[in-house]
Amino acid sequence: VFIFPPKTKDVLTITLTPKVTCVVVDISQNDPEVRFSWFIDDVEVHTAQTHAPEKQSNSTLRSVSELPIVHRDWLNGKTFKCKVNSGAFPAPIEKSISKPEGTPRGPQVYTMAPPKEEMTQSQVSITCMVKGFYPPDIYTEWKMNGQPQENYKNTPPTMDTDGSYFLYSKLNVKKETWQQGNTFTCSVLHEGLHNHHTEKSLS
């Protein structure tokens, strides 16, 4: 049995619905019945969506239950527990998850234009440095003239010397696209920010 946290973007965007997910694997087709119970701070809740078991390539079954949660419950450190009952288990299996402890610190965000030396290439790199944040859960994306872009890569959050985290995000664009004066925006979601959001632009 595995329990997974909600997606960072879902937790930090008020209009999305974060979900804690419980997954049971290696269920025998001879005893496929699995029952999920969910608890928030040890109080049972009944709002989970449990999907029909799915057959896997190794002939076992996989069962998934998703609990939609309130953003604040996750961010305020409540504990989410998934309890799984099955005839195949000698006793119910419980798995719990909550947000890592510690005081949130919002990131500083800096954007950097392509280096002069790179302008000889047909593709250039626009860089976003995101530093000084805690916890490491963060969502970073790029927009051009307000439109989401896909041609970017983020480094994983890395611990800095002061215990906070940093990352770099690199957007690749055609040199002509950069030279045309388009506006490029590095957009960051983190719980330490006002409304969880900040962005920095350059053109």
Partner: antibody, heavy 117, light 107 residues
Framework: EVQLLQSGPELVKPGASVKIPCKAS????????MDWVKQSHEKSLEWIGY????????IYNHKFKDKATLTVYKSSNIAYMELRSLTSEDTAVYYC??????????WGQGTTLTVSS | DIKMTQSPSSMYASLGERVTITCKAS??????LSWFQQKPGKSPKTLIY???RLVDGVPSRFSGSGSGQDYSLTISSLEYEDMGIYYC?????????FGGGTKLEIK
């Protein structure tokens, strides 16, 4: 730059309805709720409710449940509040406000509604 | 509904003076409290969120404090542009509710 642009003043007769638009720009419309607030001389500021533009879900202050209907037109980034069965008590300034995890960081300029025969 | 009682309802203060406005909730609101400033003919502007966090661009002379049911907004040294009406708002429970406002005028 985040902007919420509301329509100009409205003068309507008792018993009629009115639909107030709020045009959003400068951010991703579906990433924030749109809240609506009433400001009258008698009752200061009152929260009417909000709409989630991503899902269309709404939450209303029970005091306004039979008075207001919140909708959005996603493709145009416009939120609407319709007020029905208007009386003189509905005379007020109505604001839209962008609602994130932290309340109301940007507000519209307000629409003045006057209900009078 | 949670009732937000703001005091005083109006006050006069001198330039450079330290000013404190309070807001009391009818129950614990878990620090989900914001403060707004409104000038005549303008829409409200957020100053403080989650009881004590200053919005970017708001002068550092503004500060918020409090927890549980009791909260306050302090202006450390009053400036002319600070006159207006100040409102608190609880964002802990629906329906969200505002305080009745404090009208701050310069002596």
């Amino acid at each position: 730059e985040v902007q919420l642009l509301q329509s100009g003043p409205e003068l309507v007769k008792p018993g009629a309805s009115v639909k107030i638009p709020c045009k959003a720009s400068g951010y991703t419309f579906t990433d924030y709720n749109m809240d609506w607030v009433k400001q009258s001389h008698e009752k200061s500021l009152e929260w009417i409710g909000y709409i989630n533009p991503y899902s269309g879900d709404t939450i209303y202050n029970h005091k306004f449940k039979d008075k207001a209907t919140l909708t959005v037109y996603k493709s145009s980034n416009i939120a609407y509040m319709e007020l029905r069965s208007l009386t003189s008590e509905d005379t007020a300034v109505y604001y839209c406000a962008r609602g994130g995890y932290d309340y109301g960081d940007h507000w519209g300029q307000g629409t003045t509604l006057t209900v009078s025969s | 509904d949670i009732k937000m009682t703001q005091s005083p309802s109006s006050m006069y203060a001198s330039l450079g003076e330290r000013v404190t406005i309070t807001c009391k909730a009818s129950q614990d609101i878990n620090s989900y409290l914001s403060w707004f400033q409104q000038k005549p003919g303008k829409s409200p502007k957020t100053l403080i969120y989650r009881a004590n966090r200053l919005v970017d661009g708001v002068p550092s002379r503004f500060s918020g404090s409090g927890s549980g049911q009791d909260y306050s907004l302090t202006i450390s040294s009053l400036e002319y542009e600070d006159m207006g009406i100040y409102y608190c708002l609880q964002d802990d429970e629906f329906p969200r509710t505002f305080g009745g406002g404090t009208k701050l005028e310069i002596k």
